[in-house]
């Protein structure tokens, strides 16, 4: 994760900065939300554990035509070591609950903030 680039600044980005930028983007999404996020689209809920970034991307990438989360999708792809495409569920081990994108973003944000506060940047 030491070579994450292209978020807010050019060149290599420290893992702490990359995580902070992802948190900032999720905060902006939740704070700027007026109408239902992504028209109330539903996505698979994920386990916020190991492989979380890829799982989050695999879940969100299936939402199309929602500009509000495009930057988040790009950022998550920087955290996921493999290429993710729509319909791919290799990291989504459990697919039993669907939630609204807005709730997904809130849950992910809470967890990422905890990781950041704990100093877990990788």
């Amino acid at each position: 994760l030491t070579c994450l680039g292209g978020f807010a600044s050019p060149g290599p980005v420290p893992p702490s900065t990359a995580l902070r930028e992802l948190i900032e983007e999720l905060v902006n999404i939740t704070q700027n939300q007026k109408a239902p996020l992504c028209n109330g689209s539903m996505v698979w809920s994920i386990n916020l554990t190991a492989g979380m970034y890829c799982a989050a991307l695999e879940s969100l990438i299936n939402v199309s035509g929602c500009s509000a989360i495009e930057k988040t999708q790009r950022m998550l792809s920087g955290f996921c070591p493999h290429k993710v495409s729509a319909g791919q569920f290799s990291s989504l081990h459990v697919r039993d609950t669907k939630i609204e994108v807005a709730q997904f973003v809130k849950d992910l944000l809470l967890h990422l903030k905890k990781l950041f506060r704990e100093g877990q940047f990788n």
């Epitope: 948190i23 950041f116 506060r117």
Partner: antibody, heavy 123, light 107 residues
Framework: EVTLKESGPVLVKPTETLTLTCTFS??????????VDWIRQPPGKALEWLAH???????RYNPALKSRLTISKDTSKSQVVLTMTNMDPVDTATYYC???????????????WGQGTTVTVSS | DIQMTQTPSSLSASVGDRVTISCRAS??????LNWYQRKPGKVVKLLIF???KLHSGVPSRFSGSGSGTDYTLTISSLQPEDVATYFC?????????FGGGTKVEIK
Amino acid sequence: EVTLKESGPVLVKPTETLTLTCTFSGFSLSTSDMGVDWIRQPPGKALEWLAHIWWDDVKRYNPALKSRLTISKDTSKSQVVLTMTNMDPVDTATYYCARTVSSGYIYYAMDYWGQGTTVTVSS
Amino acid sequence: DIQMTQTPSSLSASVGDRVTISCRASQDIRNYLNWYQRKPGKVVKLLIFYTSKLHSGVPSRFSGSGSGTDYTLTISSLQPEDVATYFCQQGNTLPLTFGGGTKVEIK
């Protein structure tokens, strides 16, 4: 009204352990996004951040002092305690506690401070 | 650790003057820069957080600006009650670090 007050010994001998207590009011450390920091300022020097504890007991320390520091909280008493082992004359400073709130972005901005307590390390 | 260099260390200005204090970080702190005020015998007060956001109750004559490594605190019209020491603090990376302070006096 948010207030914080530091208490502890005025004088500590070298090699002893310093225990400082921050007693606060006007907020609860059981509330999400709340945290308390300890900061110190030696005479004629800049402020130095020591440690932080969040509402959910996540603790962070200044790496330069981590081996000597322990931070803990007693939510029911509205207190945060900092212990610092193996005190040395260079640890002579005014010690402050302050509140941090992390709503939205994690700013690490201390919005309310205590008055500070001066600790002298001398034999 | 990120080093915070604050200038000047002291200044003397007249009531009504525009006063600027600078803070330079040893690396990009991405706007996570806070400013504090300590008046003699009083508790430290947060003035500005995240470069330019005014803390509640802070007079509008205080403002902050900057980006990257360079940040500025401005008092648009110095008042007698602004006599204090001001210091900056970066909140981007732990350990949190502070500038050395700027003592502001009235001429």
